[in-house]
């Protein structure tokens, strides 16, 4: 698994470097997670032909994966820093159950899957420090998450492969949209 942000050799070799600002740390953290997703997608795509499926075909699924919409205030039209930040944190919290599902779904990239999960937890903490209106953030219900996890794990092999692919692609898209918005804050 790659080394977490702030612990790579370049950082060690340059102790005089200015410490990262909160925004830079968040930016680096998201890019680190995106690298992890990229590695996981490689394994998934090598293992099945899901990656060749059209977006339209994949859209026909029952997963309720978080997605950015116009009303979330993260796009240029209607951009709203506070609303957007709440959406990013809420979305990441909702993704956690799906990241838990990804554990044990990878053979050669098991560590990588764990790194993506743990790095996301750290990212949520960074973002919660940045948010002013923490009351607006709804945390998913643990019981609901537990039953969702059980349901996903009970699927047949083909559906599990499809689910894995969809989670990775949706999570990547959510992080990209989040970072685009965060870079405007």
């Amino acid at each position: 698994a790659p080394v977490p942000p702030g612990e790579d050799s370049k950082d060690v070799a340059a102790p005089h470097r200015q410490p990262l600002t909160s925004s830079e740390r968040i930016d680096k953290q998201i890019r680190y997670i995106l690298d992890g997703i990229s590695a996981l997608r490689k394994e998934t795509c090598n293992k099945s032909n899901m990656c060749e499926s059209s977006k339209e075909a994949l859209a026909e699924n029952n997963l309720n994966l978080p997605k950015m919409a116009e009303k979330d205030g993260c796009f240029q039209s209607g951009f709203n820093e506070e609303t957007c930040l709440v959406k990013i944190i809420t979305g990441l919290l909702e993704f956690e159950v799906y990241l838990e599902y990804l554990q044990n779904r990878f053979e050669s990239s098991e560590e990588q899957a764990r790194a993506v999960q743990m790095s996301t937890k750290v990212l949520i903490q960074f973002l919660q420090k940045k948010a002013k209106n923490l009351d607006a953030i709804t945390t998913p219900d643990p019981t609901t998450n537990a039953s969702l996890l059980t349901k996903l794990q009970a699927q047949n092999q083909w559906l599990q492969d499809m689910t894995t692919h969809l989670i990775l692609r949706s999570f990547k898209e959510f992080l990209q949209s989040s970072l685009r918005a965060l870079r405007q804050m």
């Epitope: 998201i30 990547k172 990209q176 970072l179 685009r180 870079r183 405007q184």
Partner: nanobody, 124 residues
Framework: EVQLVESGGGLVQPGGSLKLSCTTS????????VGWFRQAPGKEREFVAD????????WYAESVLGRFTISRDDAKNTVYLEMNGLKPEDTAVYYC?????????????????WGQGTQVTVSS
């Protein structure tokens, strides 16, 4: 890194239009975010517009909002910048840049590959 080539620049009268293209032969260009920047003589390079890996996610500088449109055709490995209602102050060398993370943004540091630029001159 990907090799980027801009084209479509030229001389145009105020109020006129141009469509710039940014092309690469690199695979997986569809996964890159692409930004357009411009640099007028004696001025700093400035952000114009960008498009994420998801084509619906675009962002524009205030000065071009409503006049310029950024779009992508992943089948052709090309990103376009359609410029309407051109003004003399739009005169500059226009550069496209790519971000392998598919994110982009309004700062040069977010991009890891750059083209050589194409000249746009708006004059009567």
């Amino acid at each position: 890194e990907v090799q980027l080539v801009e084209s479509g620049g030229g001389l145009v009268q105020p109020g006129g239009s141009l469509k710039l293209s940014c092309t690469t032969s690199g695979r997986r260009f569809s996964e890159y975010a692409v930004g357009w920047f411009r640099q007028a003589p004696g001025k700093e390079r400035e952000f114009v517009a960008d498009i994420g890996e998801q084509a619906e996610n675009t962002w524009y500088a205030e000065s071009v909002l409503g006049r310029f449109t950024i779009s992508r055709d992943d089948a052709k490995n090309t990103v376009y910048l359609e410029m309407n209602g051109l003004k003399p102050e739009d005169t500059a060398v226009y550069y496209c840049a790519a971000d392998k993370y598919g994110v982009g943004g309004n700062a040069q540091g977010y991009y890891d590959s750059w083209g050589q630029g194409t000249q746009v001159t708006v004059s009567s």
